[in-house]
């Protein structure tokens, strides 16, 4: 059962796993949620009745029954992890804590103009977990405006103390705000020879990479495959770090794979969700339960629904015994990974999908698409919406993209003459405009947020957000698209599509069926040559065929330029402007979304 509220002056008795320090009970709850075993916690707030050495302690707890006895204690705040909840979870913590010094290893000290600048510095430093900033009112003159970047083994402070005129906060890497590079490549036949901070068992290099990503100290990893010569090291995932943040030595070794933490890509690829099945593989660990199940998929469901289950092994039924049901072994361990992985025993293993809700919804795979043809099929572009105006009569105005459960991203120029959000309707999950009848459900618009610097499409900043009056329930036909990671600025996208109900030629009408066209990206230098009278800025991105023929057109405005990268779709562009439609040597010009990620997050995460 999902319990989100905090219990004041209440302490859970027993069940202690470990103690960490957090600046608030709210953050203690987040830490508990992300811990592999924690189900409950007790946080001690600052209080005159409490020993100051116990202030800010966050005791992570576990219980076979998923609950513990409650005891009254002043200044104690207790609660449950969000593991038991179905809603989306994020580790992003933008809070700034006044008069708190969060202790850790101070590895970098520099002058900063503000706490915000200090936080940005921490976010863009590969080692930084949190920071403390001495304000200009700090008593010691030589420490004023000093920004201390800190890290610890756990990613949380080793202690928290009260200290006047300082502020502390966390890195915003988990808010997708880091400018650090996102290196997705896995290097075969490579060992990174740097210090190991931890080791776990993993079935493949991808799981190893994802474990590295949410391990606070891991910057890169080496994985020894099941063909690795040394038997005791097979399936071993070594989590590594280095002072420089990069591997110092790469050794060529067969049957080993290495890669980097995906910390800077985590909002656009799954990092918690290990959804694959591993055939002829047994995961060993502490047994939680053994239940009968019809298939390995059913076994995974049972594990996902059992809050303490972390992974499972399914042994298919022998011939006709037990009504064709196999045995489903639900398991757990101290760190969420198997204690050993065995092959050749006929088992099928996998992980709980409970952690998938810690990943961005946009990373969920959508159903396979039909290649070729210009008409889309239902569910092919589930983030695409049609934006209608009802004044003076109802009509399609522009396209848009679902980027959050209350947010549509579109183009600013769509709102010419739109004097109030009241006249707008957003329809999602639509394939044909003819589906839209008087009684078709829609989302009302609460607010139109146009970029402050927008003047005209051709000069850039052609971007707008629509805040919906109600939230979108994600389904196969309506779900968000990922924003590109800032760390992905150098990615070369090769699988890009423009979609919309717009004209198919310059003098035409709105199409009934959602159209799609695969269009190659064009470099800004090439695009600039085609638009000599304009300034093609880095905040624009161009796409089109040299010979023309395929392009966005009137009515497609505001819709997505969607690019598939590493099996995940990203909103790379917003249809903005161009000379005519599909003309030779006149590419379409799109708003370059990656350049507006900060703006989008600032507007959508505003309190």
């Amino acid at each position: 059962e999902c319990v989100t509220q905090l219990l004041k002056d209440t302490c859970f008795e027993g069940g202690d796993i470990t103690t960490v320090f957090t600046p608030s009970a709210k953050y203690c709850q987040v830490v508990c949620t992300y811990h592999p075993r924690c189900l409950l916690f007790t946080f001690t707030a600052e209080s005159p009745s409490e020993d100051p050495t116990r202030w800010f302690t966050c005791v992570l707890k576990d219980s076979v029954t998923e609950t513990l006895p409650r005891v009254n204690r002043t200044a104690a705040i207790s609660g449950y992890s969000f593991k038991q909840c179905s809603h989306q979870i994020s580790a992003c913590n933008k809070d700034i804590y006044v008069d708190l010094d969060m202790k850790g290893i101070n590895y970098n000290s520099s002058v900063a103009k503000s706490a915000q600048e200090c936080q940005e510095r921490c976010t863009d430093d590969v080692h930084c977990h949190f920071f403390t900033y001495a304000t200009r009112q700090f008593p010691s003159l030589e420490h004023r405006n000093i920004c201390l970047l800190k890290h610890t083994q756990t990613g949380t402070p080793t202690r928290i103390t009260k200290l006047d005129k300082v502020v502390s906060g966390f890195s915003l890497k988990s808010c997708a705000l880091s400018n650090l590079a996102c290196i997705r490549d896995i290097f075969p036949n490579t060992v990174f020879a740097d210090s190991n901070i931890d080791s776990v068992m993993a079935p493949d290099a991808f799981v190893c990479g994802r474990i590295c990503t949410h391990h606070p100290g891991c910057l890169f990893f080496t994985f020894f495959s099941q063909e690795w010569p040394k038997e005791s090291q097979r399936n071993l995932c070594l989590l590594k770090t280095s002072e420089s943040g990069l591997p110092s030595t790469r050794i060529k070794k067969s049957k080993a794979l290495s890669g980097f933490s995906l910390q800077s890509c985590r909002h656009s690829i799954p990092v918690f969700c290990h959804s694959s099945f591993y055939h002829d593989t047994d995961f060993l660990g502490e047994e939680l339960d053994i239940v009968a199940a019809k298939s390995h998929e059913a076994c995974q469901k049972l594990c996902t629904n059992a809050v303490r289950c972390q992974f499972f092994t399914y042994t298919p039924a022998q011939a006709s015994c037990n009504e064709g049901k196999g045995k489903c072994y639900l398991k757990l361990s101290s760190n969420g990974s198997p204690t050993k992985i065995l092959h050749g025993r006929g088992g099928i293993s996998g992980y709980t999908l409970r952690l998938c809700k810690m990943d961005n919804e946009c990373t969920t795979k959508i159903k396979p698409r039909i290649v070729g043809g210009t008409a889309s099929v239902r569910g092919e572009w589930p983030w695409q919406v049609t934006l209608h105006t009802t004044s003076p009569t109802q009509r399609h105005l522009c396209g848009g993209s679902i980027i959050g459960n209350q947010w549509i991203l579109t183009a600013a120029h769509c709102f010419y003459g739109v004097e109030s959000p009241k006249i707008l309707r957003v329809y999602s999950g639509i394939l044909n405009q003819s589906e839209i009848k008087e009684d078709t459900s829609f989302f009302g618009v609460q607010e139109i947020i146009i970029h402050d610097q927008y003047k005209m499409a051709e000069s850039g900043y052609d971007i707008a957000l629509l805040k919906l009056e109600t939230t979108v329930n994600y389904t196969d036909s309506q779900r968000p698209i990922c924003l590109p990671s800032k760390g992905d600025r150098n990615v070369i996208y090769t699988d890009c599509w423009v979609t919309g109900w717009g004209y198919r030629k310059l003098r035409d009408k709105i199409q009934n069926t959602l159209q799609k066209a695969k269009i190659p990206l064009v470099t800004n230098e090439e695009c600039q040559k085609r638009y000599r009278g304009h300034k093609i800025t880095h905040k624009m991105i161009c796409a089109g065929y040299r010979e023309g023929g395929k392009d966005a057109c009137k009515g497609d405005s505001g819709g997505p330029l969607s690019c598939k990268h590493n099996e995940v779709w990203h909103l790379v562009g917003i249809t903005s402007w161009g000379e005519g439609c599909a003309q030779r040597e006149r590419p379409g010009v799109y708003t370059n979304v990656v350049e507006y990620v900060d703006w989008i997050l600032e507007k959508t995460q505003a309190v």
């Epitope: 146009i450 005209m456 051709e458 161009g578």
Partner: antibody, heavy 118, light 112 residues
Framework: QVQLQESGPGLVKPSETLSLTCTVS????????VHWVRQPPGKGLEWIGI???????YYNPKLKSRVTISVDTSKNQVSLKLSSVTAADTAVYFC????????????WGQGTLVTVSS | DVVLTQTPLSLPVTPGEPASISCRSS???????????LEWYLQKPGQSPQVLLY???NRLSGVPDRFSGSGSGTDFTLKISRVEAEDVGVYYC?????????FGQGTKLEIK
Amino acid sequence: QVQLQESGPGLVKPSETLSLTCTVSGYSISTYHVHWVRQPPGKGLEWIGIMWRDGDTYYNPKLKSRVTISVDTSKNQVSLKLSSVTAADTAVYFCARGGTLTTPFTYWGQGTLVTVSS
Amino acid sequence: DVVLTQTPLSLPVTPGEPASISCRSSQSLESRDGNTYLEWYLQKPGQSPQVLLYGVSNRLSGVPDRFSGSGSGTDFTLKISRVEAEDVGVYYCFQATHGPFTFGQGTKLEIK
């Protein structure tokens, strides 16, 4: 409700600078664009320039060398200055608010007549 | 600069009869973003102008449906299906596609 009100001297001497203020109420000046438009007596409308909501300005090139539009967000005001005026600058001066985007002009001030005469 | 030429300059109409005003542009007003930033304003005697239509043919809320607009590229028309006494004034077309923004010279509609 939204209102725009032009104010300033009704009489300006030739070669001097015409200064007008547009005070808005019912919304924050920094959330919409403000335009200045003028209309000589018995003639048509002429667009003078715009104060974009981000503080940038754009002027009619015909008047660019003489015109300055500025904003005072604390007072919710946009000002127009036109230097080296001549009798040809005698007109009713309007400020108008752009829509969600630059135009259409959804709200207008009532206009103020400025006569250039010695 | 874009020149907007309105015809006729004066338009006497009998109440209940239709009226039509043309606005011709010296260059296409179709913006590269797909919008056509062509608007029509009415300035009634002694008043500030008021917007009637934007984007060639879109009526703003509160504008009677007897006003309609059409056209594309360089040729645009404002039509009043049945003129009423309150429609008297000067009608201006206006473009915001190309800088500097420009008005037509105006068409004076009067009742016969």
